[in-house]
């Protein structure tokens, strides 16, 4: 991990950063949980998906999310976050044709059905943080991360180096 000035340098060019190719370089099917081991779940309600952050019962099955990894032409200055020196971006899809989107106006994270090529709002810069955690920074709004607020996912502005490692923007990925 690195300080906020590093984040700002790292993300300054994000608005102009284009994805290298329209195809992901690899994908990974994983369950997504918070730093405090709450599960991110997805529920179909009234023909749209809602996203929840909740404690699951002991034997309750975790929802899976497909992480699609893309190379950006913007160089990475973090060790372990890029491939061949290029920054990694991800899209997150819990079911076919639906992707997490950053709604910067509402500071919310939403699920939208859409076709490829995906809009910029569906792309997040992947940061590998401490303790095998990751964080997701909006491509469309550098310095803004997916985080947890009131048992929902929300967009959280990170404006100091202490906040960069705050628990509410850290997530764990696991196969189980």
């Amino acid at each position: 991990a690195f300080g906020i000035s590093g984040v700002q340098k790292y993300t300054r060019a994000l608005h102009d950063s284009s994805i290298t190719g329209i195809s992901p370089i690899t994908e990974y099917l994983a369950s997504l949980s918070t730093y405090n081991d709450q599960s991110i779940t997805f529920a179909l309600e009234d023909e749209s998906y809602e996203i929840y952050v909740e404690d699951l019962k002991k034997d309750e099955k975790k929802d899976k999310v497909l992480l699609s990894y893309y190379e950006s032409q913007h160089p990475s200055n973090e060790s372990g976050d890029g491939v061949d020196g290029k920054m990694l971006m991800v899209t997150l899809s819990p079911t076919k044709d639906f992707w997490l989107h950053a709604n910067n106006k509402e500071h919310s994270v939403e699920l939208h059905k859409c076709e490829k090529p995906l809009p910029d709002q569906a792309f997040f810069v992947l940061h590998n943080m401490h303790s095998n955690c990751v964080s997701f920074e909006c491509k469309t709004d550098p310095g803004v991360f997916i985080g947890v607020k009131d048992n929902h996912l929300a967009l959280i502005k990170v404006d100091s180096s202490e906040n960069l490692c705050t628990e509410n923007i850290l997530f764990k990925l696991s196969e189980t």
């Epitope: 190719g21 329209i22 195809s23 992901p24 370089i25 690899t26 994908e27 990974y28 099917l29 497909l66 990894y69 372990g80 491939v83 990694l88 079911t95 076919k96 590998n128 196969e175």
Partner: antibody, heavy 128, light 108 residues
């Protein structure tokens, strides 16, 4: 820059088990977002995918070889391995290990792979 | 499984010429998950193109890929001496992944 190197016996007797190891250098298997796999090429012929593995140990095999193949990973040694049982002369080939991108098909609920970094290959002959 | 047919089997061209290699799939796939590899004698294959049109790291821009559905093309705009080799296409839309039989590009 990630590099891969295959090792193992070059000669295996029919009905025995072929065992190969791939050592990864220049990067950690555990921290990689990629998968790892084995491909083979019989003399003068085309390429055949054998199987792939993620660092967690989750495996994906070619159905035509599945009953005879085991792929395993040892993250502490930064290695992954291939075992092919009950070999015949038809298993004579150059065996390559490779790093792989894995892509998911929602309809089939299955992963498939392309290989972006390859080892140099090792020739395995099945003969008595 | 998806069968990939490459044509022509052999392409005889001179350095500086344009090479057009074809790969046809037995079934259509919507993802454009098709890769191209180059293999020289005694060497491992090298990834050139993934996702039908995305160049792999370090691949010169004289190599380009195109196509969708069942028909895909690898184009080498101006052949360099080091480009004479065998080229394989490979689909990774569906498991098991499959390779084409290869096209040999030889010096005329």
């Amino acid at each position: 820059q990630v590099q891969l190197q295959e090792s193992g016996p070059g000669l295996v007797k029919p009905s025995e088990t072929l065992s190969l190891t791939c050592t990864v250098s220049g990067g950690s298997i555990r921290s990689s977002i990629f998968y790892w796999g084995w491909i083979r090429q019989p003399p003068g012929k085309g390429l055949e995918w054998i199987g792939s593995i993620y660092y967690s140990g989750r495996t994906y095999y070619n159905p035509s070889l599945k009953s005879r193949v085991t792929i395993s990973v040892d993250t502490s040694k930064n290695q992954f391995s291939l075992m092919l049982t009950s070999v015949t002369a038809a298993d004579t080939a150059v065996y390559y290990c490779a790093r792989a991108g894995g892509l998911y098909n929602w309809n089939d609920e299955s992963f498939s792979f392309y290989m972006d970094v390859w080892g140099n290959g090792t020739t395995v002959t099945v003969s008595s | 499984e998806i069968v990939l047919t490459q044509s022509p089997g052999t392409l005889s061209l001179s350095p500086g010429e344009r090479a057009t290699l074809s790969c046809r799939a037995s079934q259509s796939f919507s993802s454009s998950y098709l890769a191209w590899y180059q293999q020289k004698p005694g060497q491992a294959p090298r990834l050139l193109i993934y996702g039908a049109s995305s160049r792999a790291t370090g691949i010169p821009d004289r190599f380009s890929g195109s196509g969708s559905g069942t028909d895909f093309t690898l184009t080498i705009s101006r052949l360099e001496p080091e480009d004479f080799a065998v080229y394989y296409c490979q689909q990774y839309d569906r498991s098991p992944l499959t390779f084409g039989g290869g096209t040999k590009v030889e010096i005329k």
